[in-house]
């Protein structure tokens, strides 16, 4: 799988300038070479603290691995040093430079930095496996609703063409290990599991290898089981309102529900001077409820036209489904027409239960 990026053989201790962010440099070194990767700050500006990462894991400095803010040196390189390297901003984890490094059996020519190496050009160069799109392999955690399908991919290359195998929680993973089996596509470097269930949770590792080396990537799968819940009402809605006599007012209520919700708008009223009945239930009148041709969207808005002083008071958005009910309330204050409009002090939702 070609990236269309420059691929060249780099001589011993050659320093490789970093590619533009978002591009990927494919580099080949000989066994025993010093790998030097350089990642200057984008636009020449300040870089801030950085971290160097290989195959998704932060590199630990050692006598052989020399880590600087803009440069990485790996001395006496071997096959195990092949892989995907990136330089990232420490705080944001933003990738500043990508490199795909292959360390081949033979030492590199030492002089040739322009990609004119004959073995490389003729495609007979041997090399350990490497990820063809390492920047796509940064994400490691996949959370999937049960009953859906999962695909893990580890596209790689190498010469000879590497083989791919899969592990689950560190052990060989085969079709007979799960109900429904698995589907492997070696030419797509992929593992597919249909209709996942909670027992599919775990760590899945692809192991890509040829006689020159081996690389691996581990993904974590979480299978989500939904637990039904009563409707959720968006915080802050409906909001308290202050309106001038004769003006129009809208209250909004945003409802989230798995099960089909039933939405009602209620106005709190007094009966014989009391706001609540003997059992403590508020007295309300239903202003708006579902009809044959009303949509949920329409029910999420309560419109009051040409308001009077009688419209002042407490309004409640009540939403119910098969699991339970939720409600939020807000107040309407009506001012005389000649008064200046004053915002309600306690703007926002009054949560009622």
């Amino acid at each position: 799988e070609s990236l269309g990026t420059e691929q060249r053989v780099v001589g011993r201790a050659a320093e490789v300038p970093g590619p533009e962010p978002g591009q990927q440099e494919q580099l080949v070194f000989g066994s025993g070479d010093a790998v030097e990767l350089s990642c200057p700050p984008p636009g020449g500006g300040p870089m801030g603290p950085t971290v160097w990462v290989k195959d998704g894991t932060g590199l630990v400095p050692s006598e052989r691995v020399l880590v600087g803010p803009q440069r990485l040196q790996v001395l006496n390189a071997s096959h195990e040093d092949s892989g995907a390297y990136s330089c990232r901003q420490r705080l944001t984890q933003r990738v500043l430079c990508h490199f795909s490094v292959r360390v081949t059996d033979a030492p590199s020519s030492g002089d040739d930095e322009d990609g004119e190496d004959e073995a490389e050009d003729t495609g007979v160069d041997t090399g350990a496996p490497y990820w063809t799109r390492p920047e796509r392999m940064d994400k490691k955690l996949l959370a999937v609703p049960a009953a859906n399908t999962v695909r893990f991919r580890c596209p790689a290359a190498g010469n000879p063409t590497p083989s791919i195998s899969w592990l689950k929680n560190g052990r060989e993973f085969r079709g007979e290990h799960r109900i429904g089996g698995i589907k492997l596509r070696h030419q797509q470097w992929s593992l597919v599991m249909e209709s996942v269930v909670p027992s599919d949770r775990g760590n899945y590792t692809c192991v890509v290898e040829n006689k020159f080396g081996s690389i691996r990537q581990t993904y974590t799968l979480d299978v989500l089981e939904r637990s039904p819940h009563r409707p959720i009402l968006q915080a802050g809605l409906p909001a308290n309102q202050t309106a001038v006599l004769g003006s129009d007012v809208e209250f909004h209520c945003k409802v989230y529900s798995d099960a089909q919700p039933h939405i009602q708008w209620l106005k709190h009223v007094e009966v014989n001077g009391s706001k609540v009945g003997p059992d403590g239930t508020p007295y309300v009148t239903v202003l708006k409820t579902a009809g044959a041709n009303t949509t949920d969207k329409e029910l999420e808005v309560l419109s009051l036209h040409n308001v009077t002083f009688e419209d002042a008071g407490e309004y409640t958005c009540l939403a119910g489904n098969s699991i339970g009910f939720s409600h939020h309330s807000a107040w309407l204050v009506v001012l005389p027409a000649e008064e200046e409009l004053v915002e309600a002090d306690e703007a926002g939702s009054v949560y009622a239960g």
Partner: antibody
Framework: EVQLVESGGGLVQPGGSLRLSCAAS????????ISWVRQAPGKGLEWVGR????????NYADSVKGRFTISADTSKNTAYLQMNSLRAEDTAVYYC????????????????????WGQGTLVTVSS | DIQMTQSPSSLSASVGDRVTITCRAS??????LAWYKQKPGKAPKLLIY???FLYSGVPSRFSGSGSGTDFTLTISSLQPEDFATYYC?????????FGQGTKVEIK
């Protein structure tokens, strides 16, 4: 056995409304999604929209956005297609289909596959 | 929108023939392509998903291949029940779009 049964089709005047139902059985309703696909007489298939039954999220084709609404009642295992402001070009057989996602970290989209379909219900918009 | 173009629009073949239908996307859709089969007056049926994965219960004479913009559905040995209209459909982009269909008729 997975089954989807549409109902609610019929003759309606331009500008009118209709609500189609899709009753599902044989699978865990809230785990996957329901798509609506239509087929005008003698024509090909056109995707109308989709809802994810777990989180209630919806997507619509531009041709129906603002006029059609997909919803679901998980207690009844039923999805709905509310069609308002109907036009002559909405005349078609409407199918609902169970829709599952193929989740893949390697790409930045979810592939959606419609694996079980209902028998379809005919909606005719005519004066 | 991503346009899906199938070819041919129709073809005539005999039982036992090998039949190939192609589908071209107006932009790269990776392997996010499904194939459906529809008989007159019936609902479509899923055959292939993700370009090359055979859906469960579908006979192995059906196979799919391709990635990017060019895809192929192959029926290795046409059977009487395979005479139908076949649609490809992509779902990388919004909205999901179908090809115009390929009608496979009896020669």
């Amino acid at each position: 056995e997975v089954q989807l049964v549409e109902s609610g089709g019929g003759l309606v005047q331009p500008g009118g409304s209709l609500r189609l139902s899709c009753a599902a059985s044989g699978f865990t309703f809230t785990s996957t999604g329901i798509s609506w696909v239509r087929q005008a007489p003698g024509k090909g298939l056109e995707w109308v929209g989709r809802t994810h039954l777990g989180d209630g999220s919806t997507n619509y084709a531009d041709s129906v956005k603002g006029r059609f609404t997909i919803s679901a009642d998980t207690s009844k295992n039923t999805a709905y297609l509310q069609m308002n402001s109907l036009r002559a070009e909405d005349t078609a057989v409407y199918y609902c289909a169970r829709t599952y996602g193929i989740y893949d970290l390697y790409v930045d989209y979810t592939e959606y596959v419609m694996d079980y379909w209902g028998q379809g219900t005919l909606v005719t918009v005519s004066s | 929108d991503i346009q899906m173009t199938q070819s041919p629009s129709s073809l005539s073949a005999s039982v036992g023939d090998r039949v190939t239908i192609t589908c071209r996307a107006s932009q790269d859709v990776d392997t996010s392509l499904a194939w459906y089969k529809q008989k007159p007056g019936k609902a479509p049926k899923l055959l292939i998903y993700s370009a090359s994965f055979l859906y469960s219960g579908v006979p192995s004479r059906f196979s799919g291949s391709g990635s990017g913009t060019d895809f192929t559905l192959t029926i290795s040995s046409l059977q009487p029940e395979d005479f139908a209209t076949y649609y490809c459909q992509q779902s990388t982009g919004h909205p999901q779009t179908f090809g115009q269909g390929t009608k496979v008729e009896i020669k």
